[in-house]
C-alpha cells in the first residue's frame, strides 16, 4: 500500500523558519503534490505550494522555497515573519496525486519535545485520506 511521510523541522538558525519534507512511498508516477497548513487541503487547510513534476511549482507566502528533492519527495521552506508565520504546533499536510494509485495525504507537525534544528525522523505518517 502506498504511504506518504511528512517531516517538519524548525531551523536552528532561524527559530521561526520551518522546513517541511514530504515523500511518497509507492510505485506510481506522481502527477501533483499539494502542501497545506492548518489541516488537509480542502478541509480547512490553506495551500502553501503546488508542485507538478514537469510543469513547474507554484507557492504562496509564507512559503519561501518549494522544490523537488527526488522524483518522489519534496521540500518546502517557510519564512517565519509576520502574521502568517507558522508556530510550533502548526499542522502541515502533503497530498500526493499518483497514477494509478489515486490521491494520498498525510499530515505532521513539529515533535513536541524537539529542539531547534532537530526533527523527527521521516517515518510514514498516518494516512488521512486516500481518494
Amino acid at each position: 500500500t502506498p504511504e506518504v511521510w511528512v517531516q517538519v523541522r524548525m531551523e536552528a538558525t532561524e527559530l521561526s523558519s520551518f522546513t517541511i519534507r514530504c515523500g511518497f512511498l509507492g510505485s506510481g508516477s506522481i502527477s501533483l503534490v499539494t502542501v497545506s497548513w492548518g489541516g488537509p487541503n480542502g478541509a480547512g487547510g490553506t495551500t502553501l505550494a503546488v508542485l507538478h513534476p514537469e510543469r513547474g511549482i507554484r507557492q504562496w507566502a509564507p512559503a519561501r522555497q518549494a522544490r523537488w528533492e527526488t522524483q518522489s519527495s519534496i521540500s518546502l521552506i517557510l519564512e517565519g515573519s509576520g502574521a502568517s508565520s507558522p508556530c510550533a504546533n502548526t499542522t502541515f499536510c502533503c497530498k500526493f496525486a499518483s497514477f494509478p494509485e489515486g490521491s494520498w495525504e498525510a499530515c505532521g507537525s513539529l515533535p513536541p519535545s524537539s529542539d531547534p534544528g532537530l526533527s523527527a525522523p521521516p517515518t510514514p505518517a498516518p494516512i488521512l485520506r486516500a481518494d
Partner: antibody, heavy 114, light 113 residues
C-alpha cells in the same frame, strides 16, 4: 472541458481604473492559480501575477505591483483583475490562464484613450 | 529575473520543411532534485491566446501533433517541427517555468516562404 471566459473589451480614460473578469468552468477553481498575462504589440508576453482562489493568496510581478490587484469569488468561480491609474502604456490585451498556462481565456482588450 | 532569448526572431519556410528554433535562458531551468527542466513552448496565432505545446522541455501537451518536439536541458533548448504545415504559421514563445516570475522570450515568427 476546462474553459476560461473573459469579460469584453474596455475603452477607458487615462487615470481611470478597470476591472476585468475571468470565469472558470470545468475544473476545481479553488485548487489552481489564475494567472494574468499582458500582451502589447511588439512587447511580447508579460506575467502580471497570480491568485489562488481557494485562499486568495497572491503573487505579483514586481513590475506590476501597485498597478494590478487580484481578487477571486469562489461562489461564482470568477477571478478579477483591477488595473488602476491607467495610462497609454496599459493599453493591451490581458489574458487569464490556469494550470501552468495550459488553459487560456480569449483575452480582454483594454484601450486607454482620452 | 530569468531572461529568455529566442533565435531567430523570424523564419521563412516552405510546407513540408523541417524547422528548428532555439531558446536560451540566463539561468539553468533544470531542477536537480527530479532532473526535470522547467521550460514550456507556446504557439500563438493572430487574434488568439497562446496555446501550450510543450512543457517540461520535452513533454507534448495533450492533443499536440507529434511533429512538434522539444529538447534541451539547463540553459539551451530547441523546438523542432519535423514537417511544417500551413496551420503551423504562427509566433512561437518559450517560457521559464522554473522560478518566479515566469518570463517569456520575445518569440520566433514562422512565416511562409
Amino acid at each position: 472541458q476546462v474553459q476560461l471566459q473573459q469579460s469584453g473589451a474596455e475603452l477607458v480614460k487615462p487615470g481611470a481604473s478597470v476591472k476585468i473578469s475571468c470565469k472558470a468552468t470545468g475544473y476545481t477553481f479553488s485548487s489552481f492559480s489564475i494567472e494574468w498575462v499582458k500582451q502589447r504589440p511588439g512587447h511580447g508576453l508579460a506575467w502580471i501575477g497570480e491568485i489562488l482562489p481557494g485562499s486568495n493568496s497572491t503573487n505579483y510581478n514586481e513590475k506590476f505591483k501597485g498597478k494590478a490587484t487580484f481578487t477571486a469569488d469562489t461562489s461564482s468561480n470568477t477571478a478579477y483583475m483591477q488595473l488602476s491609474s491607467l495610462t497609454s502604456e496599459d493599453s493591451a490585451v490581458y489574458y487569464c490562464s490556469s494550470y501552468w498556462f495550459a488553459y487560456w481565456g480569449q483575452g480582454t482588450l483594454v484601450t486607454v484613450s482620452a | 529575473d530569468i531572461v529568455m532569448t529566442q533565435s531567430p526572431s523570424s523564419l521563412s519556410v516552405s510546407a513540408g520543411e523541417k524547422v528548428t528554433m532555439s531558446c536560451k535562458s540566463s539561468q539553468s531551468l533544470l531542477n536537480s532534485g527530479n532532473q526535470k527542466n522547467y521550460l514550456a513552448w507556446y504557439q500563438q496565432k493572430p487574434g488568439q491566446p497562446p496555446k501550450l505545446l510543450i512543457y517540461g522541455a520535452s513533454t507534448r501537451e495533450s492533443g499536440v501533433p507529434d511533429r512538434f518536439t522539444g529538447s534541451g536541458s539547463g540553459t539551451d533548448f530547441t523546438l523542432t517541427i519535423s514537417s511544417v504545415q500551413a496551420e503551423d504559421l504562427a509566433v512561437y514563445y518559450c517560457q521559464n517555468a522554473h522560478s518566479y516570475p515566469p518570463t517569456f522570450a520575445a518569440g520566433t515568427k514562422l512565416e511562409l516562404k
